[in-house]
Structure formats: C-alpha cells, structure tokens
C-alpha cells in the first residue's frame, strides 16, 4: 500500500545534519522500518517481541536511529547537495496482524544554509 506524501514534517534540520522522522501507529508492536533514498535502502530498524514481552531491536543496515512508541528517527550527517532526493519510510507491520506494508515519503531539499561546514 503506497500512501504517498507524509502528512507531517518529515525532515528536521540541525547542525549540518537532518533527522528523518518515520511515524507509525502506536498500536503497532512489531515492525520493520526502512529508510529508502529513491529505491535504495539506506537504513533499517526491526522491533520484535519475544517471550515475556522482551523487546529486541535489530538493524541490518545501521544508521544512527532513535525509537519512540510511534516513530523511528534516522539521522543523516554531513549534508551536501547529493543528499537531495526523495526519501521514503517503508513500514512493514508484523503485529498486530495481518501483515501490512505502507510507504510514506517526501523530497529532501538541500539549501546552502543547511549544509555542513560551509565556507565563509
């Protein structure tokens, strides 16, 4: 299921980097969130629950990330013009069933004021 544009602020700039916010419903207990740049997987984070409700967080493509009860934030640093692209949050829901995949995204515009280490 492709939902198109995120209906929230997906990109938060700070210190020459960007926080990309991937939201999900707080009812979701087990999932995989991938950050795509165009069609390429940049980062992923998988949250699963084992016996006794022990939570496991795994990443196959590791980025600096932050997990809350309704979002995963991925952090990209040292921005330059090559970072300008479409970015998508690809959410795969395992629990609650049934399995669902949903894609939301937006275009990351890079302006001079947001670049790292600008030459004065």
């Amino acid at each position: 299921e492709i939902n198109g544009s995120a209906n929230y602020e997906m990109f938060i700039f700070h210190n020459g980097g960007v926080q990309i916010l991937c939201k999900y419903p707080d009812i979701v207990q087990q999932f995989k969130m991938q950050l795509l740049k165009g069609g390429q997987i940049l980062c992923d984070l998988t949250k699963t629950k084992g016996s006794g409700n022990t939570v496991s967080i795994k990443s196959l493509k590791f980025c600096h990330s932050q997990l809350s009860n309704n979002s995963v934030s991925f952090f990209l640093y040292n921005l330059d013009h090559s970072h300008a692209n479409y970015y998508f949050c690809n959410l795969s829901i395992f629990d609650p069933p049934p399995f669902k995949v949903t894609l939301t995204g937006g275009y990351l515009h890079i302006y001079e004021s947001q670049l790292c280490c600008q030459l004065k």
């Epitope: 939902n3 929230y8 999900y24 419903p25 069933p97």
Partner: antibody, heavy 125, light 108 residues
C-alpha cells in the same frame, strides 16, 4: 451489488476432506483480508482462519494443521482446504472480508463488512 | 486470547423502546471492536466498527460507544426488524479473532 458466494459444502465422513470456495464480485477483492467464520446451528460465531492481502495466513488452534486457507486474487476467489475432518467441524461456513488501512500514525480497521450466505459442512459417519 | 462477554444473554423489549447491549473484553482492545446483527438463516451484518462508527447503510438509531474493555451498543427506538441476535467482535489482539457469545433481542 457487493457479494460473496460460498460453495463446496456437503456431507463427509470423519477423517475425510472438503474444499470450500468463495467467489467475490463487485468489490476490490485484493484489498481485503479474507476470513472463514463458522457457526454450529443455534450457536455463536467462531473464527476459523484468515489470509491477508500479502498472503499471510492465520488459523484458530482447533483447525491448525488440518485446514489450509488460500486466495487467488486474479480469480477473486478464496478457498479453505479442510482435511482430517471431525464431528466438531460440522457447521455453516461463512466467508467474510475486512480491511485495515495504515496512514502515518493512524491504524484504521473497517470491520467485516462483506459476508457470504454460508455453505453447510456436515461431518458424520 | 481476548474473551468477550456479552450481557444480557437475552433482552425482552417492545418496539419503540430503547435497547442497551453490553460487551466486556478481558483485556484492553482500545476501540477495535465491531458489532454485528444476525437474523435466523442469514449471515451476520456489520453494524458498527471502531466501537462507534456506523457501517454503510446502517440506520442512525444504532450507535456504539466505549473504549478499552467496556462497550455498548444502543438502539434508540426499536423497530420490528431489529429483533435478532447481536454479536461483538475484536480483531486487534489475534489470532484468534474472537466474538462474544451473543445477545438475543426478543419481542416482549
């Protein structure tokens, strides 16, 4: 008119097999998660099995390992292969569909809004 | 497994009266509850989803409320065609999907 039509029910001996079918029309079958729900005469509703839009399958403990659910989106069809049938499987079997939509932080469940008329399965020697 | 307990088992009322049916869940299911009506020899019909949303084509006299573990289906003024069996159902903590045992609404 949106409809589901079940077929394949009948009389079968304990240990036997049946294959139920459910044909859908007038709605976008591929967007629905599909279920089989059964009802013993005069009793309540019992969920049997489900298959998601991605083909993921789910079963009640009472039929796990004996029943297999499948779907063929190109034919707008749902199936339930029932093996090793028992007396306790005697019931009217309904196929039904529901939808879950995820948008950002919202998780919408729209309920089982399409149902077939049911097909009767009788397991008896 | 989420157990749904409906009460009363049978409700005897007259046309024009108000009917209040209850469904209690054994654990928090938020608002992921549906209500169905079933008449003899027919398939169930979805009345309410998401605890309080009327399904397409359902008359305004049917309303649902509640969240968490306690839910209510209200029929504001009973019509003759409303006498049937009513089931609640959850599909958030599953498998299995579970139904309540049903409330039979009969004419007094």
């Amino acid at each position: 008119e949106v409809q589901l039509v079940e077929s394949g029910g009948g009389l079968v001996q304990p240990g036997g097999s049946l294959r139920l079918s459910c044909a859908a029309s007038e709605f976008i079958f591929s967007t629905y998660d599909m279920h089989w729900v059964r009802q013993v005469t005069g009793k309540g509703l019992e969920w049997v099995s489900a298959i998601g839009t991605a083909g993921d399958t789910y079963y009640s403990d009472s039929v796990k390992g004996r029943f297999t659910i499948s779907r063929e989106n190109a034919k707008n069809s749902l199936y339930l292969q029932m093996n090793s049938l028992r007396d306790g499987d005697t019931a009217v079997y309904f196929c039904t569909g529901d939808r879950t939509v995820v948008r950002g932080v919202n998780y919408y469940y729209y309920g089982m809004d399409v149902w077939g008329q049911g097909t009767t399965v009788t397991v008896s020697s | 497994e989420v157990v749904l307990t409906q009460s009363p088992a049978t409700l005897s009322l007259s046309p024009g009266e108000r009917a209040t049916l209850s469904c209690r869940a054994s654990q928090n299911i938020r608002n992921y509850l549906a209500w169905f009506q079933q008449k003899p020899g027919q398939a169930p019909r979805l009345l309410i989803y998401g605890a309080s949303n009327r399904a397409t084509g359902i008359p305004a006299r049917f309303s649902g409320s509640g969240s968490g573990t306690d839910f209510t289906l209200t029929i504001s003024s009973l019509e003759p065609e409303d006498f049937a069996v009513y089931y609640c159902q959850q599909r958030i903590n599953w498998p299995p999907i579970t139904f309540g045992q049903g409330t039979r609404l009969e004419i007094k």
